[in-house]
Interface confidence: medium
């Protein structure tokens, strides 16, 4: 028979032959042959496959550093990493919650929509057209452009979500 | 490297009134929006006041509203918290930070305690 171009799902291809992927929890010892089935090995104690794979290796547990202010949220198995979260009235700085921050900042080109409390943090809001901000800043509002022709002025640089608008004064015509 | 000290605190009578100092050093001073924040004793960490990095723009907790107020001297690279009409429940070790990073760069505090 034609030896496989493609195999079914949960089986890979090795040696012109399918063989079985090793299920979610379990790595790869040695694959397939035509007279045995594929050999897997259950992860280690604090380590995790989380898909159907031909891994050698399981991925380690995440670390929850108490020095960057996180714990664990949820222990992880053999087929799932650790959950991390921030120490209470601490905030992820990001949705892989690698480090904390007591309120987090709005970066330039975004305002403060709502100052943190002691259970929700910082909201930020993009600055819209008219409006800038350039801080990093847990409190401060996107800033309206300056208006320049209130000062009898006019605009010599247009302005950004980061920039204030740059203005001059009016080109006067010779008599 | 960035270094922040705190100064000014001790034991005061409620009502009575302390300033804290930072000196900073180590970084662009004015660049930053500087922060106190305290924790009371067995408590987690409160903040309490931040201001913009020109000084221009002050926020407080609600906690201390009316009672406190930061200031800065970019000239002398120094966040100052006066703090008026004190109440037992202001007594904490006050730190001052330059952004609130769990990890970021603190001071070492100074002990405010308010009894009588």
């Known amino acids: 028979p034609e030896p496989p171009t493609a195999c079914r799902e949960k089986q890979y291809l090795i040696n012109s032959q399918c063989c079985s992927l090793c299920q979610p929890g379990q790595k790869l010892v040695s694959d397939c042959t035509e007279f045995t089935e594929t050999e897997c090995l259950p992860c280690g104690e604090s380590e995790f496959l989380d898909t159907w794979n031909r891994e050698t290796h399981c991925h380690q547990h995440k670390y929850c550093d108490p020095n960057l202010g996180l714990r664990v949220q949820q222990k992880g198995t053999s087929e799932t990493d650790t959950i991390c979260t921030c120490e209470e009235g601490w905030h992820c700085t990001s949705e892989a919650c690698e480090s904390c921050v007591l309120h987090r900042s709005c970066s330039p080109g975004f305002g403060v929509k709502q100052i943190a409390t002691g259970v929700s943090d910082t909201i930020c809001e993009p600055c819209p057209v008219g409006f800038f901000s350039n801080v990093s800043s847990a409190f401060e509002k996107c800033h309206p452009w300056t208006s320049c022709e209130t000062k009898d002025l006019v605009v010599q640089q247009a302005g950004t979500n980061k920039t204030d608008v740059v203005c001059g004064p009016q080109d006067r015509l010779r008599a | 490297e960035v270094q922040l000290l705190e100064s000014g605190g001790g034991l005061v009578q409620p009502g009575g009134s302390l300033r804290l100092s930072c000196a900073a050093s180590?970084?662009?001073?004015?660049?930053?929006?500087m922060q106190w924040v305290r924790r009371a004793p067995g408590k987690g960490l409160e903040w309490v006041s931040a201001?913009?990095?020109?000084?221009?723009?002050?926020y407080y907790a609600d906690s201390v509203k009316g009672r406190f107020t930061i200031s800065r001297d970019n000239s002398k690279n120094t966040l100052y918290l006066q703090m008026n009409s004190l109440r037992a429940e202001d007594t904490a070790v006050y730190y001052c930070?330059?952004?609130?990073?769990?990890?970021?760069?603190w001071g070492r505090g100074t002990l405010v305690t308010v009894s009588s």
């Open positions: 930070a330059k952004e609130l990073l769990f990890f970021d760069y």
């Open positions: 180590g970084f662009t001073f004015e660049w930053y929006e």
């Open positions: 201001i913009s990095g020109d000084g221009y723009r002050t």
